[in-house]
Interface confidence: medium
């Protein structure tokens, strides 16, 4: 059984003030608003911001922006019609859609990964659609702490 | 729906409901926020048969206690069932315990529309025998 | 009978500050989101800022940014608008508005006008 | 920021004229468009939200229409006291915007 705690924080529209997770035994502690999933926890935004300020937000609250497992990874929100910045951007040097942490974009994931323009950042809908778009256009984004 | 009601608010079910829960946990595949967990379910139920689902789960039809848990819920799921119905287009708005709900629900002056949903950020009144996603909850 | 009443408007210069306050009553203030809205001289409405009931979520707009505070006490009916750094472009009439939980601004203040000028 | 574009800025009309004020938004947002009607020196009144649902108390010659990112406000029979500004407004997103305004004047 995965369970999350609840730690009284309350941030203001940006994903909440800087704050070590707490693990125990048996138990994922995520702060106040935001989801706990599986053992993940996700700040889901409703504020729009570009690609980058987005990844600044995250990272401020020692997360990333989204990093996908799999396509049922946001499962739990799969009805949502919204799309949101993930930590997905394309390496030159590498020539290749890279995460965040570095490792490539599987190419399951998003079969018309090919599509995409390497210039753009790519926005993710929670049913499994993603897109490419502008890095300075606004988008609402989703950061995600992994507790295991 | 009121013969369901009084099942609901039966106090030793309410109990089993509460032993059910401990040390804080979430069981798995539910999610949780703000101290809370959450079914986000995928069926389509009617309101009754989303109350009776919600209830073997050993948890309650979505209730909405204040308005930042609305819109985290609306983000979440565009629409689902939730815990506040009324007998008649003559009486009240309900919560499960009974209490009257207070808040704005659309479409209420139609006769025929007896329990509420919540649809993409709003509160409306549906036929209790339409068949909408549910989602159920626990409080930690 | 829901009633909004914003003060605490006036002249002030560039670079100075200024709080305004905005008093609820006819309704439960403590279970609706607040929010700002600016109008300026001959111009049309603009979203300044918002709070949610208990303060959790605070959203601004990008032109107040790091200048503007909302803050609310629940305790005195009351939603506030600390202004610092203003500039001749913040000269406006700020209102308040109410958020009918997830319905969009149902009841307003009279608004207030602030000026800022040399 | 999602932008609303309003069409007209401005339109003159006659007394049960049917009138039509148009919002288009930059980006897709369901059906979370708001109306406001202004008077001079006065706060904005709410009409319209959800795109189409009448405010309670609000003259049922007001209709709302639209999805997305194509939204009308309809006036089906202008009387005097509907001479105004009409403002819409996304609530889909932070943060939340308007439109410039459509100023609908007395031919």
């Known amino acids: 059984k995965n369970s999350f705690t609840k730690l009284s924080i309350e941030p203001a529209f940006t994903p909440g003030p800087n704050i070590e997770l707490q693990k125990d035994s048996d138990c994922c502690s995520c702060q106040e608003k935001w989801v706990g999933y599986r053992c993940n926890c996700y700040f889901i935004s409703s504020e729009q911001k570009t690609w980058n300020e987005s990844r600044h937000l995250c990272a401020s609250q020692k997360s990333s922006l989204l990093q996908l497992q799999n396509t049922d990874e946001l499962d739990f929100m799969s009805s949502s019609q919204q799309f949101y910045w993930i930590g997905l951007s394309y390496s030159e040097e590498h020539t290749a859609w890279l995460w965040e942490n570095g490792s490539a974009l599987s190419q399951y994931l998003f079969p018309s990964f090919e599509t995409f323009n390497t210039k753009n950042c790519i926005a993710y809908n929670p049913n499994g659609n993603a897109l490419d778009e502008s890095c300075e256009d606004k988008n609402r984004y989703i950061c995600k702490q992994q507790l295991i | 729906p009121s013969t369901l009601i009084q099942r609901h608010n039966n106090s030793s079910l309410n109990t089993r409901t509460q032993k059910a829960r401990h040390c804080g946990h979430c069981p798995e595949e539910w999610i949780t926020y703000s101290n809370s967990c959450y079914y986000i379910g995928k069926e389509r139920r009617t309101w009754e048969e989303s109350l009776l689902a919600c209830t073997s789960k050993n948890s309650s039809l979505l209730s909405i206690d204040n308005e930042e848990e609305m819109k985290f819920l609306s983000i979440i799921s565009p629409s689902s069932w939730i815990g506040v119905f009324r007998n008649s287009s003559h009486h009240p708005w309900v919560t499960m315990n009974g209490l009257a709900f207070k808040h704005e629900i659309k479409d209420s002056d139609n006769a025929e529309l007896n329990c509420a949903v919540l649809q993409v950020n709003r509160l409306k009144s549906a036929q209790c025998g339409s068949s909408i996603i549910y989602h159920c909850k626990h409080k930690l | 009978e829901v009633q909004l009443v914003e003060s605490g408007g006036g002249l002030v210069k560039p670079g100075g500050s200024l709080r305004l306050s905005c008093a609820a009553s006819?309704?439960?203030?403590?279970?609706?989101?607040m929010n700002w809205v600016r109008q300026a001289p001959g111009k049309g409405l603009e979203w300044v800022s918002a709070i949610s009931s208990s303060s959790s979520y605070i959203y601004y707009a990008d032109s107040v940014k790091g200048r503007f505070t909302i803050s609310r006490d629940n305790a005195k009916n009351s939603l506030y608008l600390q202004m610092n750094s203003l500039r001749a472009e913040d000269t406006a009439v700020y209102y308040c508005a109410r958020e009918e939980w997830g319905l969009p601004f149902d009841y307003w203040g009279q608004g207030i006008l602030v000026t800022v000028s040399s | 920021a999602i932008q609303l574009t309003q069409s007209p800025s401005s339109l003159s009309a006659s007394v049960g004229d049917r009138v039509t004020i148009t919002c288009r938004a930059s980006q897709g947002i369901q059906s979370a468009l708001a109306w406001y009607q202004q008077k001079p020196g006065k706060a904005p009144k709410l009409l319209i939200y959800?795109?189409?649902s009448l405010k309670s108390g609000v003259p049922s010659r007001f209709s709302g229409s639209g999805s997305g990112t194509d939204f009308t406000l309809t006036i089906s029979s202008l009387q005097p006291e509907d001479f105004a500004t009409y403002y819409c407004q996304q609530f889909n997103s932070y943060p939340l915007t308007f439109g410039q305004g459509t100023r609908l004047e007395i031919k």
């Open positions: 006819g309704f439960t203030f403590s279970s609706h989101s």
């Open positions: 959800d795109a189409s």
